[in-house]
Interface confidence: low
């Protein structure tokens, strides 16, 4: 369901989008992800904040936790224990980095309707979770891990060496959180809660990034984060497992690192429990083209974990880095030794493989010039996954079921024809044993969430259809959207073009390129959005284009790995090539072309403006990377190698924005950054500004005091208002 674009006799009642609409979030949509608690039950927070349990099979629902109880501790989140005796309530949420936050936790006893008193949890807690069975609690407080057998029991302290910014237990440090796991936690319960595995990160030798946080004090305080930039000392990681039934008996046991990994700097990339006594760990060399998957077994006699070499599986890339953005995770089958995993096939497309003994003998499950993207669930007889196979549009996502119980396996697209015009980009959420599942469609029409039978795929009910949004959009002149491709020199460049409502091919329009372009990203997706660029097309009459060039994902390794060890070259070239093709289409005013991007997109937009082509009149970089030597080791080295003479220092030096300062002379450049950006440090923009000043090049700049990489809150309004004025001035559009 795409809101009507037809211009009829009611056209005079239709209005264009305003910037206010965007900043107020007037046209935001809702999704519905059930919080599954069994094969046929889920929890959901109602509009009035009651926590309601739904039973799909009986059709009954009842409130398990009232909004009054939630409000009594100002709870913003909750978690039901698997035995359904307790609920944790989360309040005093305090954001840290992308995923991490601290909070206060209260435990509510459902059996007596009271909060658990005595042995209350300390505060603030960095992470807390129930065991998968019963109601044991594991939590992290001041970088140490604690265990409770029952919520009212005194805690058992598992680790003692935790120290702020030095040793992290059960939670990741900055770089593991952002670039490797990427989660706020680094501890994992075994399936029945017998064991608890956790990571310890030692950051003692990591250089610290320090920046001022101004607040409103007389003296700004300094934020210090151990943050390894490219080539710097990295965290040292160790994995431990403790028996949670008798935690004091032998204490935490370290899991050995595979010898071929331990011989030089390495990363831990993920942990997957297979059974209560079998665990799978994934490791990665610092030079991220070799990954090792290691399956380890518990030795009852020695109370240790044994990882035989025969259970090590190596994944190696000869053309780029291992995996896509991350190395994929295994999904184990019921025999508890074989597994399904996505990796590149011999033709260079990411596909599902079945590994029974060795990777060399893997059986390829999917194949074609498209990519398998995620394995959602493996049951006794079915495997559910998503891919972009359907109709050969890489920016779509459909859900498929492969029957693995029969031979040959048969494949069925579950979503391809459900709501074909409205829905071409899906994700899914499965209940236990895939008895039921929810489909969440993100577009291109108005998002809709539905509930389905896991055996027949039949739709049971609509969970959320965004009716209010649909009604609100009825009198809005939304822009038109097209997704098409350009074939240039054996490269396919997919693009999305957003066109003004009364678009006329015979007229000339200003063009704005919105770019991200980072390795393994995708901007051209069949999803619904009413955002800033929708407003620019609807109200200001601009054409906006997004282009997926070399380095982007889900179209095969040739396109993806083209940027390996050479960031900042082909991504920029492909944006420029696309602009030239758009000019040839005849409706672009070639004197009014701009480019803008955020983060990696700010880097690409800066390099495009400084490309010397004369194509761009103006452009904006928000929170750009300016030199790869300033960015995080895990991310940067994955794509660039090391900044050393005997590796890739030369391209690190050649690919900076500063090296092109002179070329900004003939463009209007707006540079924007938050001063408290923990991710892409303000240093990046400070160095661009310094280089431009030294080259005596005029430019515009805006900083956002105490704002991070997201520039949220009131800064968002200021940012988009400021950028709008800049673009309108550049394109000579009246205010």
């Amino acid at each position: 369901l795409r809101p009507s674009r037809v211009h009829n006799s009611e056209e005079n009642t239709m209005r264009a989008l305003t910037l206010k609409d965007i900043l107020n979030g007037t046209f935001s949509y809702k999704t519905f992800f059930p919080n599954w608690i069994s094969g046929q039950e889920y929890l959901h927070q109602s509009a009035d904040n009651n926590i309601v349990l739904y039973n799909i099979e009986t059709g009954q629902s009842y409130t398990i936790l009232s909004n009054r109880t939630m409000k009594s501790v100002n709870a913003s989140n909750y978690g039901l224990s698997p035995d359904r005796q307790f609920v944790y309530l989360e309040s005093d949420y305090s954001k840290l980095w992308r995923y991490s936050y601290t909070a206060t936790y209260y435990i509510y006893d459902l059996s007596n309707g009271e909060f658990v008193r005595g042995n209350e949890l300390p505060r603030p807690i960095q992470y807390l979770c129930w065991s998968p069975v019963g109601s044991k609690l594991a939590y992290v407080y001041q970088n140490n891990i604690y265990l409770k057998q029952r919520p009212g029991d005194p805690p058992f302290q598992i680790t003692f060496n935790g120290r702020e910014n030095k040793i992290f237990n059960g939670i990741p440090d900055w770089v593991y959180e952002e670039e490797m796991l990427p989660t706020k936690y680094a501890l994992w319960w075994s399936p029945n809660g017998k064991f608890l595995a956790y990571a310890e990160f030692n950051d003692k030798d990591i250089p610290v990034i320090a920046y001022s946080y101004y607040g409103d004090e007389q003296y700004p305080r300094t934020i210090n984060i151990p943050y390894p930039k490219a080539g710097a000392k990295n965290p040292v990681v160790r994995i431990f497992i403790i028996d949670t039934t008798y935690p004091a008996y032998v204490g935490p046991q370290e899991v050995p690192v595979p010898a071929m990994i331990a011989s030089s700097d390495y990363y831990f990339s993920w942990l997957t429990w297979v059974t209560d006594e079998r665990v799978c760990l994934q490791w990665l060399k610092r030079v991220q083209n070799v990954s090792v998957l290691s399956i380890c077994d518990f030795r009852e006699d020695w109370q240790t974990w044994d990882c035989p070499k025969t259970q090590e599986h190596i994944e190696e890339s000869r053309t780029g880095w291992a995996g896509g953005f991350f190395v994929s995770r295994p999904v184990f089958s019921y025999d508890a030794i074989s597994y399904y995993k996505i990796f590149s096939d011999k033709d260079g497309y990411k596909h599902i493989h079945y590994i029974k003994d060795t990777v060399e003998n893997a059986i390829q499950i999917t194949s074609g010039k498209w990519e398998a993207i995620n394995i959602f669930r493996v049951t006794q007889d079915s495997l559910f996954y998503s891919s972009n196979e359907f109709e050969e549009y890489p920016g779509r996502r459909n859900i498929y079921r492969i029957s693995i119980g029969s031979y040959p396996p048969s494949k069925k697209c579950v979503t391809c024809h459900l709501r074909k015009e409205r829905c071409q980009y899906y994700t899914a959420s499965f209940s236990d044993y895939a008895k039921y599942y929810a489909l969440v469609c993100y577009g291109p029409g108005i998002p809709i969430s539905t509930l389905h039978d896991g055996r027949t795929d039949q739709e049971i009910k609509i969970l959320e259809e965004n009716k209010e949004l649909e009604n609100a959009l009825k009198n809005i002149q939304l822009p038109k959207e097209e997704i098409k491709k350009l074939e240039v020199d054996e490269i396919t460049l997919w693009y999305k073009m957003i066109l003004p409502p009364q678009f006329d091919r015979s007229k000339k329009y200003p063009l704005l390129i919105q770019v991200y372009g980072g390795p393994c990203s995708q901007s051209v997706r069949s999803v619904f959005a009413v955002n800033w660029i929708s407003y620019l097309a609807s109200k200001e009459g601009m054409v906006i284009a997004l282009v997926d060039g070399r380095g982007t994902a889900f179209q095969g390794d040739k396109l993806l790995y083209a940027v390996y060890r050479k960031l900042g070259v082909y991504e920029v070239e492909d944006q420029i090539t696309a602009v030239r093709k758009f000019i040839e289409m005849g409706f672009i005013d070639e004197k009014r072309i701009a480019i803008w991007g955020w983060s990696y997109g700010g880097y690409v937009s800066s390099l495009a403006l400084a490309s010397g082509t004369g194509l761009f009149k103006c452009g904006i970089a928000v929170a750009p990377v300016s030199s790869w030597e300033y960015y995080a080791s895990v991310y940067t080295e994955r794509f660039m190698g090391l900044p050393t003479k005997d590796d890739n220092l030369e391209h690190y030096k050649n690919s900076t924005v500063m090296a092109r300062a002179e070329y900004f002379r003939n463009v209007d450049y707006l540079l924007i950054h938050g001063t408290a950006d923990d991710n892409v440090h303000f240093q990046n923009s400070a160095q661009i500004a310094k280089a431009l000043v030294n080259a005596q090049v005029d430019f515009q700049a805006m900083w956002y005091s105490d704002q991070n990489h997201g520039l949220s809150g009131l800064s968002t309004n200021h940012l988009y208002t400021h950028m709008t004025h800049f673009l309108k001035q550049c394109f000579s559009l009246s205010d």
Epitope: V73, N74, S91, D92, S94, T102, T104, R123, P124, G215, D216, E217, R221
Partner: nanobody, 123 residues
């Protein structure tokens, strides 16, 4: 900006009690987390108790069960009820305020401070 003024300190015998008060200027008192720190001669300033804007309290292990922190948003005041005082509780007690979560034990995270009030516990 918020200005803080403590009162209620004094000399007391061991096992005695004192009620410390801290009055804050400004209309947005209710949005601040409030804390009581103390500093004994030659020692680091340490967080004793803190209370979030929502009323959740935190206590240092050394004072749990003896001290109680509370706030009265209508009076712009935060209180520290100190019972069963010990000689080692002798220190200058400071009131502090910050926006956001209350459970930050490092003084650097608390931008607003009072002048302090002396508490002396004699044996």
């Amino acid at each position: 900006q918020v200005q803080l003024q403590e009162s209620g300190g004094g000399l007391v015998e061991a096992e005695g009690s004192l009620r410390l008060s801290c009055i804050a200027s400004g209309r947005t008192f209710g949005t601040y987390a409030m804390g009581w720190f103390r500093q004994a001669p030659g020692k680091e300033r340490e967080l004793v108790a803190a209370i979030s804007s929502g009323g959740s309290a935190y206590y240092a292990d050394s004072v749990k069960g003896r001290f109680t922190i509370s706030r009265d948003n209508a009076r712009n005041t935060v209180y520290l009820q100190t019972n069963s005082l010990k000689p080692e509780d002798t220190a200058v007690y400071y009131c502090a305020a910050r926006r956001g979560s209350a459970y930050y034990t490092n003084r650097i995270d608390w931008p607003y401070w009072g002048q302090g009030t002396q508490v002396t516990v004699s044996s």
